[in-house]
Every structure is written in structure tokens, then in C-alpha cells.
């Protein structure tokens, strides 16, 4: 004969445990039902009656099967630099994440406690490592032959256009200027130009002008390491 299915509350076998979605009530010394997500235990079980569950009130929740006497309070409303990516319901807490252009500087178990605006690389500097949900943008100086003319948290250093005839040579913050005939650059469709790790030869330090070796080519000498926020703006 099949074993008889026990209905809660019931006394567990000596040394046994309660089943899934049940808990052992120390007072009643019985296996009793847990309450489902979105509810809490309004009345605990006894030897003869099972747990009585009730729905969570507004702005409170339970996410798991439980036997808590009160539902948990949802977190406070999201701040102006955050967006609500998960609303407060009876079954889940509100989750606030940083809005686009910001990253999480101080995280909590779910969502973010403190958001900060992503660093913007100033002209002459490009994004070496893009920002993520939890990390800031890293800027790098545009290496020779490349430039960035924007203040941006997303723009990388791009190569100067190759001209048929150069009117003004490019520099770190300006593209080459070509005369009337069309330049010879077009980005390959679908070519994802990802920021590259800065190799030692393009890790240029804060430059100091040196005597020019030739018109249109101003060679500069490095004098020392750049400060950490070099290339970024404060906003």
C-alpha cells in the first residue's frame, strides 16, 4: 500500500524533516505550511490548525515562501538619477538602477544605492574602457594619427582622415582638414571599432612642447604621469 499523504499540520518522523514549502513550528512541534510569495503568516499553526496566510499590504512584499508575521517594506522611491527597473509589488521589492549616462558607485543587494555620472572624455582623449552599470569610463589620450573632438562618455579616438591633399594636419583633438578633393576615409559597415587597451607606446604622458622638428609636425616630450582624471570633465 502507498504511504498515506500527511496533511499539515502533522508530526514529522523522529529525526525526519518537513517537506518542501513547509516549516517546523517549535511551539506546535508540527510541520506546517509556509505562505506563498506576496503573503505572510497572519496566524501561526497549532497542533490542530494550519498556518493562516494573508496578503501583503500596499508597499510591502514577500519574495519567497515564508512564515514571517509581517511583510517586508519596499525600498524608498527611486532618486532623480535613477530609474525604477522593477516596481514594488506584493511579491517583489522595488529595484532602482542608474539612468543612462550614470553608473552605480555604491551598490546594494538589489539595485543601486548611489549613482554617479559617467566621466566624459574631453577633446584629445577618447574612451579606453566604456562605462558599465557598476564602473566608470576610463579615458586615454588619443595616440598620434588619431583624434577625438568631442566631450563624451562614449566616443573613442578615431584615425585622422587620409587626404588627397592636406590643408591642415590633424592633431589629438582635430581631424585632418583636406582641400577640395574628397578625403579617403569611410568606416567599414559593421566594423565595430572597440576601444583598445592602451599599449605602452601610446600611453602618452602629459606633454610639454619641444622645439619643432619640421613645420606641421610638432613633436612633444612627456614630462610625467597624468593625473587619474586626465582627459575627463567633471560633469
Amino acid at each position: 500500500l502507498p504511504a498515506q499523504v500527511a496533511f499539515t499540520p502533522y508530526a514529522p518522523e523522529p529525526g525526519g524533516t518537513c517537506r518542501l514549502r513547509e516549516y517546523y513550528d517549535q511551539t506546535a512541534q508540527m510541520c506546517c505550511s509556509k505562505c506563498p510569495p506576496g503573503q505572510h503568516a497572519k496566524v501561526f499553526c497549532t497542533k490542530t490548525s494550519d498556518t493562516v496566510c494573508d496578503s501583503c499590504e500596499d508597499s510591502t512584499y514577500t519574495q519567497l515562501w515564508n512564515w514571517v508575521p509581517e511583510c517586508l517594506s519596499c525600498g524608498s522611491r527611486c532618486s532623480s538619477d535613477q530609474v525604477e527597473t522593477q516596481a514594488c509589488t506584493r511579491e517583489q521589492n522595488r529595484i532602482c538602477t542608474c539612468r543612462p549616462g550614470w553608473y552605480c558607485a555604491l551598490s546594494k543587494q538589489e539595485g543601486c544605492r548611489l549613482c554617479a555620472q559617467l566621466r566624459k572624455c574631453r577633446p584629445g582623449f577618447g574612451v579606453a574602457r566604456p562605462g558599465t552599470e557598476t564602473s566608470d569610463v576610463v579615458c586615454k589620450p588619443c595616440a598620434p594619427g588619431t583624434f577625438s573632438n568631442t566631450t563624451s562618455s562614449t566616443d573613442i579616438c578615431r584615425p585622422h582622415q587620409i587626404c588627397h591633399v592636406v590643408a591642415i594636419p590633424g592633431n589629438a583633438s582635430m581631424d585632418a582638414v583636406c582641400t577640395s578633393t574628397s578625403p579617403t576615409r569611410s568606416m567599414a559597415p559593421g566594423a565595430v571599432h572597440l576601444p583598445q587597451p592602451v599599449s605602452t607606446r601610446s600611453q602618452h604622458t602629459q606633454p610639454t612642447p619641444a622645439p619643432s622638428t619640421a613645420p606641421g609636425t610638432s613633436f612633444l616630450l612627456p614630462v610625467g604621469p597624468s593625473p587619474p582624471a586626465e582627459g575627463s570633465t567633471g560633469d
Epitope: 598620434p144 588619431t146 578615431r158 592636406v166 571599432h193 601610446s202 609636425t217 612633444l220
Partner: antibody, heavy 129, light 110 residues
Framework: QSLEESGGDLVVPGTSLTLTCTAS?????????MCWVRQAPGKGLEWIAC????????TYYASWAKGRFTVSRTSSTTATLQMTSLTAADTATYFC??????????????????????WGPGTLVTVSS | ALVMTQTPASVSAAVGGTVTINCQAS??????LAWYQQKPGQPPKLLIY???YLTSGVPSRFKGSGSGTEYTLTISGVQCDDAATYYC????????????FGGGTEVVVK
């Protein structure tokens, strides 16, 4: 714009030869490096040297070419490559090519972005006894 | 000295097929890489510079990619006119690193 090499010839080992690169449609002194690249018959490309094409322009050479090859600018439209102590291994088509300059940040003597965007048709140098 | 290793030495493709050419630098060249196309009796032609930027007039079926020491030229929808030898080139020069070309890859179109 165009480039054209001249001076290629059949010479005997141990002699010297000067190749000339003539630019048309642009001035050498306007923000360009003029370079020389060679290609032995049926082989790959081998960079030789470049000169920043302004008066007293800076030069840079492949390590194997230093001493035996000299690049210079002779006018606003011509650059030359002087080759000495030629051997059979120097038999090749010699191309002149240009690459664009820009304001440089870094160490003196470092040249980045040497993209050869304009080439001449080449001139053949044969070294044989 | 910087060495550019290009593979394969030769590749055959049918019209409409895809060709992939690899170029490995012996050290990080920080995207300073160019690709050239050379046909018999002609000088090389610059196709791609700074690893992924097409020069004007070059069909979009040519695509450059890669970073650090590994670079790739992909020709999608190969055409008869693409039959040529292709060279990669590290586009950087200093006292201890010289501009260098790969050994070349011959593309045969069937």
C-alpha cells in the same frame, strides 16, 4: 596626384645608384612623408626609409638600410634614394610612396600611422655581373 | 624586431564566397595596422587603415578587424576583381620598432 620613380637600371655589384621620385599635383613640402619600399621579384614588400618632406626634413630608416641607403628631398616635387655597395640581393622594383603627417604627441623620433596612401608604379633595379 | 606573420600564404575562393586573411604581430601594435591589395605589375593599393577603416572607393565587402596582436581581413561576397595578393603592415616606427609588412596572401578566385 601621382608619384613616379625613375633611375632604375641594370648595374654591377658594388656600384651605386640614385633613384628619383617625382610628385605631380601636390607639393612634397605640404604635410607628407615620402617613403621608399622595395619588392624583389616574386617576393613581398620591404620598407626602406622615409623623409619628412620639408627642408631639412627628419629621416628614418629600416635597420638593414642604415648606412647604405640615403633618402633626401631635392626640390619641392622630387625626393631621391641613394644606394651604395649594391648586391644581387638588392635586385627589386623600388616604389616611392607617401604618408600623411599630423601633429605628433610622444617621443621625438616616433612616427605613427605610416599608411602609404599613394604609390608610384615602381622602377626596376637589377644588380648583376 | 617587429615581425608580421600573415596566414595563409595562399587561399582559393569561389565567386560569392568569403575569404579570411589573418595577420599576427609579434608585439602589440595598438591598431596601427593597414591592409593593401596588389595586382601583378601594379603598386599596392591601401584598402584599410587603423585596423578597420576603409579608404574611399574600397567596396564594403572588405572588412578589417582585430586589436592588440591579432588582425583579420575579411572579404565577403568575393568577386573576380578581388584576385590579388594582400599584405598587412604595421604602421608604426620608433627606435626599436620598424614599420613591417606581412609576407602576403595570394587570393585566387575560381
Amino acid at each position: 596626384q601621382s608619384l613616379e620613380e625613375s633611375g632604375g637600371d641594370l648595374v654591377v655589384p658594388g656600384t651605386s645608384l640614385t633613384l628619383t621620385c617625382t610628385a605631380s599635383g601636390f607639393d612634397l613640402s605640404s604635410f607628407y612623408y615620402m617613403c621608399w619600399v622595395r619588392q624583389a621579384p616574386g617576393k613581398g614588400l620591404e620598407w626602406i626609409a622615409c623623409i619628412y618632406a620639408v627642408s631639412s626634413g627628419s629621416t628614418y630608416y629600416a635597420s638593414w638600410a642604415k648606412g647604405r641607403f640615403t633618402v633626401s628631398r631635392t626640390s619641392s616635387t622630387t625626393a631621391t634614394l641613394q644606394m651604395t655597395s649594391l648586391t644581387a640581393a638588392d635586385t627589386a622594383t623600388y616604389f616611392c610612396a607617401r604618408h600623411q603627417s599630423y601633429e605628433t604627441y610622444g617621443y621625438v623620433g616616433v612616427v605613427y600611422a605610416t599608411y602609404f596612401s599613394l604609390w608610384g608604379p615602381g622602377t626596376l633595379v637589377t644588380v648583376s655581373s | 624586431a617587429l615581425v608580421m606573420t600573415q596566414t595563409p600564404a595562399s587561399v582559393s575562393a569561389a565567386v560569392g564566397g568569403t575569404v579570411t586573411i589573418n595577420c599576427q604581430a609579434s608585439e602589440d601594435i595598438d591598431s596601427y595596422l593597414a591592409w593593401y591589395q596588389q595586382k601583378p605589375g601594379q603598386p599596392p593599393k591601401l584598402l584599410i587603415y587603423y585596423a578597420s577603416y576603409l579608404t574611399s572607393g574600397v567596396p564594403s565587402r572588405f572588412k578589417g578587424s582585430g586589436s592588440g596582436t591579432e588582425y583579420t581581413l575579411t572579404i565577403s561576397g568575393v568577386q573576380c576583381d578581388d584576385a590579388a595578393t594582400y599584405y598587412c603592415q604595421s604602421a608604426f616606427y620608433s627606435n626599436n620598432t620598424e614599420t613591417a609588412f606581412g609576407g602576403g596572401t595570394e587570393v585566387v578566385v575560381k
